[in-house]
Every structure is written in C-alpha cells, then in structure tokens.
Amino acid sequence: MRRGPRSLRGRDAPAPTPCVPAECFDLLVRHCVACGLLRTPRPKPAGASSPAPRTALQPQESVGAGAGEAALPLPGLL
C-alpha cells in the first residue's frame, strides 16, 4: 500500500498565510505567488484559528485532508 509523505513540519512559513486571496504561499521560495490557475476559493479552517497545513497528502489524492484543510492537486503552478 502506498504511503503518504511524513509530516512536513519545520519549514519557516507563517501561519496563516500572509498572501492575498488570489495567491498561495510557496514554501520553496517562501513568498506569495499567483494561484490564478486553481480557480478555487481559499479553504476555510474548521474551528482552527491557524489553518496553516503542515502535512502533505499524496499528490494523487484529491480533496479531504482533514478538518477544514483541502489538499488539491496542483498541476505545476510554478
């Protein structure tokens, strides 16, 4: 059975994201970038004041990362 990635905690990224709604925070370069291709609303946290996700899902997985987090396939984007 395929395993998902380990928790990706530890990278210096602010939480919540400092980006404007049309942008995503790229963890590789640590700044906001356009997310226009996604055409999706910003995920809403469920009862969490800090929705910053720190665990990655399998890229093959779709939506449903857990409480209020969305793990969306991101086709390249950058």
Partner: antibody, heavy 126, light 107 residues
Framework: EVQLVQSGGGVVQPGRSLRLSCAAS????????MHWVRQAPGKCLEWVAV????????YYGDSVKGRFTISRDNSKNTLYLQMNSLRDEDTAVYYC???????????????????WGQGTTVTVSS | EIVLTQSPSSLSASVGDRVTITCRAS??????LNWYQQKPGKAPKLLIY???SLQSGVPSRFSGSGSGTDFTLTISSLQPEDFATYYC?????????FGCGTKVEIK
Amino acid sequence: EVQLVQSGGGVVQPGRSLRLSCAASGFTFSMYGMHWVRQAPGKCLEWVAVIWYDASNKYYGDSVKGRFTISRDNSKNTLYLQMNSLRDEDTAVYYCARRFTRLRGWYIEDYGLDVWGQGTTVTVSS
Amino acid sequence: EIVLTQSPSSLSASVGDRVTITCRASQSISSYLNWYQQKPGKAPKLLIYAASSLQSGVPSRFSGSGSGTDFTLTISSLQPEDFATYYCQQSYSIPLTFGCGTKVEIK
C-alpha cells in the same frame, strides 16, 4: 505520453552563446513550472534554473547567474535556456525537467522533478 | 546552500540483496528530500518524494525514510534493473541541490 524533447546542444567556443530548447507534450505545459539541471562529465547533478508556469518568477544557480536566461513560450509548449558567455566549466549534459508540486491548504509544497527530458550535450571548447 | 552528502559513494551487491543508501543534509530540511535513479546515458527518474512517498509506477521494493537531516533509501531485494546511480535532492529551498550519487554495482 508525457514527454520532454530537447534540442540545441553542440560544440561552442568559450565566450560564445547557445540556446537550448525543450518541447513539451502530453500535459498542459502552461500549468507547470520548469527547471534546467546539468551534469558535467563524471560529476554531480547541478541545478541551473527554474521558471514559473507563467514566467512571472525565475531563479538561477550562482554559477550561471547573469549569463544564462530561462524563458518559455506557452503558446509553443517550449522551454528555453539562453546561454551566453559560455565557459569551459559549462560543458555538461543539460536536462529540462518538470517541477512537481502540490497544494496543501493554501501552501505550495515541492516534491522535486517528476518528468525529465532526454538530455542534450553542450561542449565548450576552443 | 544546503549540502547533501551521500554514502557510500559506491557499493557492490548481488541480486536479491537488501541495499541501503544514506543522505545527510547540512541543515534540517524537514521531509523535503527526494530520491532519483539514473542509468548511464539516461535522464534521472524520480523514485521517492517527500522522504518516504513512492512515485507512481515505481516498484514497492524501493522505500525511503528519514526527516530533518538524515535520510535513507532502501531497496528491499535488488533486481538486475536496479544497478544504477542513485541521487538524493532537497526541495526545501532554492538553490535546489543534489547529492553526488551512490553507484550500485554488480558484485
């Protein structure tokens, strides 16, 4: 089939220029960031440059900064590497590769390079 | 720049052997570590991403582990097609960096 086909390599004298091309097929090129990576004979892999899906951002390795320019033409599904002021130490096999990323919440995480071109040889020699 | 140190630089093994390759980062990179296989005259191929996730189409005999600074690639039962050079690569920060490879040769 997802494919990257490279062209443009060859033998060039020090100080001259060369442009490499990487033609993409089998996926929506305009939605992917792209890299150039090189490998000198018998040496380690060295990252050269990356360009965003829309060319809005570009980053370069220190050894090529100011001499090489990464660009793309999404209408032609093609990635380019313009190499100027070539040096002996630029001799290598050059690979184009697709950036592998996924969105987690509103954060982009990087998983490396998941599709590679076949490589093209650049030899800088007088 | 994050430096990745692979060990051993080469090893000899037989078909069916369990092979372990290590990669050490000069600073913590969380789990942003990927593994590639390269055969002579060919481009690298992504095997493992995010330290432990198997890339689509890669045989399950390949596995990865580790986080922080120490990572391992394991081939549970070496097959004839696995003789190649293996590279680790960090995607924690720009510039992307690679280890210098571990060549797996036939004993």
